[in-house]
């Protein structure tokens, strides 16, 4: 592989690494969305909630003069609970029905698939470095692209979950916004998907430049 190509691959792999870190952060944190109730619920405090793939947390936040609930970063009494279908022994009280069980399970499962693809891609990359097997970068690129797509699906499932929670008559949440875990997931999708495609392009053998050349005539990769 030429030096130019090697540099391109390294930059792409760095972007992929950033995507992996962002994807991991999104999966393990619970600030995908922040939900808040009617402001009139409490005189001095309001109970906002933030949740992720695995658990939901509520926080009693002191209300400011503008009668808004938040931001969620304000200090307050926090109460976190894993979704009951992930931890059958624990009662998630107010939170169980507010999250659509099938949505939550789907988003988490797809996110796990994404991490699986990331692991497979990383194994291929490591093996390609070890014995200069550059052809392993191609399956690696596909795995990273699939991982990005899985993250995208997870993001969309979570969006639908939030929409249903807000629309449902069985919840008190009336307002919402997407938070930094959600942003991490979106950024992870962009990095993994685009970098995966870029890696695929950079790892392909050079196309023949002249009509009389065949792919076999193209200069070898090593």
């Amino acid at each position: 592989m030429s030096q130019t190509k090697t540099l391109k691959v390294r930059v792409t792999l760095f972007c992929i690494l950033a995507g992996i870190v962002l994807a991991m952060t999104a999966v393990v944190t619970d600030h995908w969305a922040v939900l808040s109730p009617h402001m009139e619920h409490h005189n001095t405090t309001c109970e906002a909630a933030h949740f992720g793939l695995w658990r939901i947390c509520t926080k009693r936040i002191p209300m400011d003069d503008s009668k808004t609930c938040g931001p969620i970063t304000l200090p307050g009494e926090k109460n976190c609970s894993y979704f009951r279908h992930f931890n059958p022994g624990e009662s998630s009280e107010i939170f169980e029905f507010t999250t659509q069980k099938e949505y939550s399970i789907s988003a988490a499962a797809i996110a796990i698939f994404s991490l699986g693809f990331v692991i497979l891609g990383s194994l291929c990359v490591l093996l390609s470095f070890g014995k200069k097997r550059d052809y392993l970068l191609r399956p690696a690129s596909m795995f990273y692209t699939f991982a990005g797509l899985c993250i995208l699906v997870s993001v969309e499932v979570m969006r639908q979950s939030v929409k249903r929670m807000i629309d449902s008559e069985d919840t008190v949440w009336i307002e919402y916004y997407y938070s930094w875990s959600f942003a991490c997931a979106c950024a992870a999708f962009v990095l993994l998907f685009l970098s995966g495609l870029a890696l695929l392009l950079f790892s392909l053998p050079r196309m023949p430049r002249n009509p009389w050349e065949s792919c076999m005539d193209a200069e070898p990769e090593h």
């Epitope: 109730p37 009617h38 402001m39 009139e40 619920h41 009280e93 107010i94 169980e96 029905f97 629309d167 449902s168 008559e169 069985d170 919840t171 008190v172 009336i174 307002e175």
Partner: antibody
Framework: QVQLQESGPGLVKPSETLSLTCTVS????????WTWLRQPPGKGLEWIGY???????NYNPSLKSRVTISVDTSKNQFSLKLNSVTAADTAVYYC??????????WGQGTLVTVSS | EIVLTQSPGTLSLSPGERATLSCRAS???????LAWYQQRPGQAPRLLIY???NRATAIPDRFSGSGSGTDFTLTISRLEPEDFEVYSC?????????FGGGTKVEIK
């Protein structure tokens, strides 16, 4: 399919306490919010307040000083108590599933008349 | 609290005609959180529309909701005999929840 049924006395004397019970069938009272509303004859509906199965409640400010909503999960019931009633409290009282949004599941309603 | 005013109080129409019911709020309703109900005499209200324009489950598509801010409309495209009832609007944009006084749709 969840069904709700209100029960209680149809006649209450002024200054006394109005007590109604809503029995939930077809679903557990757990994990849901439950609401009381009322409709005076020929008038619009009025939201009284709601309770969560864990016991936390929220009331309409105009009735807050007189109203108490409680829940009995073992019987799958929730109740309304309205103190110091007057003729203005004469209405059809409804129980419904939900809290502070719209209401899809309602009881049939029970008419309570306040009269001596 | 938000006061909801429905107009007209009574609407006289024939089956097959189009009905347009209005609900005006005393202040802006957050996120268009408005619902419409149909109520038959001696029965509980039946949810028709929520979120100003979303039809509830099993509600025929002749019922549609529109509007935003302070002005909302329920439209029944072709009145069926069973549609001649009382219709109420309800806001859930802020507490306390409030309802309109209702519009009675009667046969002309």
């Amino acid at each position: 399919q969840v069904q709700l049924q209100e029960s209680g006395p149809g006649l209450v004397k002024p200054s006394e306490t109005l007590s109604l019970t809503c029995t939930v069938s077809g679903d557990s009272i757990n994990n849901y919010y439950w609401t009381w509303l009322r409709q005076p004859p020929g008038k619009g509906l009025e939201w009284i307040g709601y309770i969560y199965y864990s016991g936390s409640a929220n009331y309409n400010p105009s009735l807050k000083s007189r109203v108490t909503i409680s829940v009995d999960t073992s019987k799958n019931q929730f109740s309304l108590k309205l103190n110091s009633v007057t003729a203005a409290d004469t209405a059809v009282y409804y129980c419904a599933r939900g809290a502070v949004k719209y209401f899809r599941h309602w009881g049939q309603g029970t008419l309570v008349t306040v009269s001596s | 609290e938000i006061v909801l005013t429905q107009s007209p109080g009574t609407l006289s129409l024939s089956p097959g005609e189009r009905a347009t019911l209005s609900c005006r709020a005393s202040q802006t309703i957050n996120h268009n959180n408005l619902a419409w109900y149909q109520q038959r005499p001696g029965q509980a209200p039946r949810l028709l529309i929520y979120g100003a324009s979303n039809r509830a489950t099993a509600i025929p598509d002749r019922f549609s909701g529109s509007g935003s801010g302070t002005d909302f409309t329920l439209t029944i495209s072709r009145l069926e005999p069973e549609d001649f009832e009382v219709y109420s609007c309800q806001q859930y944009g802020s507490l306390p929840l409030t309802f309109g006084g209702g519009t009675k749709v009667e046969i002309k």
